[in-house]
């Protein structure tokens, strides 16, 4: 599982006039991490775990980065020609990743009124545009604006992604929070299904990092994939994750089934409550 930093910025226009504010959220390893507080002109940590990532740092750099990015995106929106009356939005999602082998990946996506119209793979410098004519027009608008000073733009986007990776590395290096190991709390529950059957659910919560194996076993052997239902591994808002796996079994055979969990080199088995 790679470490990732994801920026989500949105700017708005009303009747062709670009609005002064911007919305910004940053996710770190899939967790809500920062948001920009417009009223206080500050990047604000999302929860105690985010505060802990930088310890006693002031979020000064993050505030300046988001402010600069918001300004850039407002300028980009101002160059989109087809803005009609009413409210319109330009959204930019930027992601950078560091993989276990230390390789990196960066991408960028632009959405107009919620519709994707331009994507870039930063490593290959490849731009992708969906087939629709509206997307083609919007993409041409934005590409032309970005190409007005081609070298500056190229430098700008490479610098932007280098900054993203630099920030991500900084968080990873400086933060014990992101190097910590939090074992999951595992809870097994049962509920009546159809006659003679019960559904058993195994929930793992409050674990970090995100990688986990959670599976049902019968007589010590893992059940086949298609006899189990898995939930997504989702952030729980506290800097940790949660997930679940469920299966249907015959009533009376509960003692043959266990939930197997493996996380950060530790494993455990959990029986079905009688």
């Amino acid at each position: 599982e790679p470490h990732s930093l994801r920026y989500n910025l949105t700017v708005l226009s009303w009747d062709g006039s670009v609005q002064s504010g911007f919305l910004a959220e940053v996710h770190l390893d899939g967790q809500p991490f920062l948001r920009y507080d417009r009223q206080k002109c500050r990047a604000k940590p999302q929860g105690q775990w985010a505060e802990d990532v930088l310890g006693n740092k002031t979020w000064d750099r993050e505030t300046r980065d988001l402010t600069g990015n918001g300004k850039d995106l407002r300028m980009t929106l101002a160059h989109i020609k087809d803005q009609k009356e009413g409210l319109h939005s330009l959204q930019e999602i930027r992601v950078c990743e560091i993989h276990e082998d230390n390789s990196t990946r960066s991408s960028q996506h632009f959405y107009y009124d919620g519709e994707l119209f331009l994507s870039q793979n930063v490593e290959t410098e490849e731009w992708t545009v969906p087939q629709s004519s509206r997307a083609q027009t919007l993409a041409m608008n934005v590409r032309n604006f970005l190409k007005e000073d081609a070298m500056k733009t190229k430098t700008h986007y490479h610098a932007m992604h280098a900054d993203c990776l630099q920030e991500l590395r900084r968080y990873l290096e400086s933060s014990v929070v992101l190097r910590r190991r939090v074992p999951p709390m595992v809870n097994v529950t049962r509920s009546e299904a159809s006659e003679g059957n019960i559904t058993v659910t195994c929930r793992a919560s409050s674990f970090y990092p995100r990688n986990i194996t959670l599976t049902w076993r019968q007589d010590g052997v893992s059940l086949s994939h298609d006899t189990q239902q898995w939930g997504d591994v989702l952030p729980d808002g506290n800097g940790t994750y949660q997930t679940w796996v469920a299966t249907r079994i015959c009533q009376g055979e509960e003692q043959r089934f266990t939930c197997y969990m493996e996380h950060s080199g530790n494993h455990s088995t959990h029986p079905v409550p009688s």
């Epitope: 009223q39 206080k40 740092k57």
Partner: antibody, heavy 118, light 107 residues
Framework: QVQLQQPGAELVRPGASVKLSCKAS????????MNWMKQRPGQGLEWIGM????????RLNQKFKDKATLTVDKSSSTAYMQLNSPTSEDSAVYYC???????????WGQGTSVTVSS | DILLTQSPAILSVSPGARVSFSCRAS??????IHWYQQRTNGSPRLLIK???ESISGIPSRFSGSGSGTDFTLSINSVESEDIADYYC?????????FGAGTKLELK
């Protein structure tokens, strides 16, 4: 134009709390953080803390957590700093200053000179 | 707390000379340093923000440079009105801290 008005001086008895004021004008008071600094005679500046008038969110230097209490009165566009249980160590000039961008202080009051003496 | 060490404590210069003030941080603070001027019996005035960004209304003879731990404020041609104390302030870590200041005086 932006102005931060502070009383020139306050004479305080040891142990008797004092509330210093900073009246803001010429800008939207609830849109900017207000910071407070301490400067002892012939010495440098110390940051005490900051408050955002919109909702009174406060960030205090841990060194002053028992010494200073920051408040605002939105109706009069005034920021206050109460000095609790003052001693001679608290004799200093206290400045309020508006924050222009993140953590940079563009407008300062004239300072209130506090003398703690019996 | 981040310690900001300013040197020298006192700088004596002739009018028209170029002068540089040094501010060294006890650890990396990126470019989160700001410079203030305080004349005798006056309030501090912001001169430079974020190491090198100029401030509206501040004469162009004031400039700043540096990043990481070493920062410099320069006045390229000192005038008599520049006689004052100069302070650096960091905003990268809580609490915000100031240097002890450098006093500029005329020879």
């Amino acid at each position: 134009q932006v102005q931060l008005q502070q009383p020139g001086a306050e004479l305080v008895r040891p142990g008797a709390s004092v509330k210093l004021s900073c009246k803001a004008s010429g800008y939207s008071f609830t849109s900017y953080w207000m910071n407070w600094m301490k400067q002892r005679p012939g010495q440098g500046l110390e940051w005490i803390g900051m408050i955002h008038p919109s909702d009174s969110e406060t960030r205090l230097n841990q060194k002053f957590k028992d010494k200073a209490t920051l408040t605002v009165d939105k109706s009069s566009s005034t920021a206050y700093m109460q000095l609790n249980s003052p001693t001679s160590e608290d004799s200093a000039v206290y400045y309020c200053a508006r924050e222009m961008g993140p953590y940079t202080l563009d407008y300062w009051g004239q300072g209130t000179s506090v003398t703690v003496s019996s | 707390d981040i310690l900001l060490t300013q040197s020298p404590a006192i700088l004596s210069v002739s009018p028209g000379a170029r002068v540089s003030f040094s501010c060294r941080a006890s650890q990396n603070i990126d470019t989160s340093i700001h410079w203030y001027q305080q004349r005798t019996n006056g309030s501090p005035r912001l001169l430079i923000k974020y190491a090198s960004e100029s401030i509206s209304g501040i004469p162009s003879r004031f400039s700043g440079s540096g990043s990481g731990t070493d920062f410099t404020l320069s006045i390229n041609s000192v005038e008599s009105e520049d006689i004052a104390d100069y302070y650096c302030q960091q905003s990268n870590y809580w609490p915000l801290t100031f240097g002890a200041g450098t006093k500029l005086e005329l020879k």
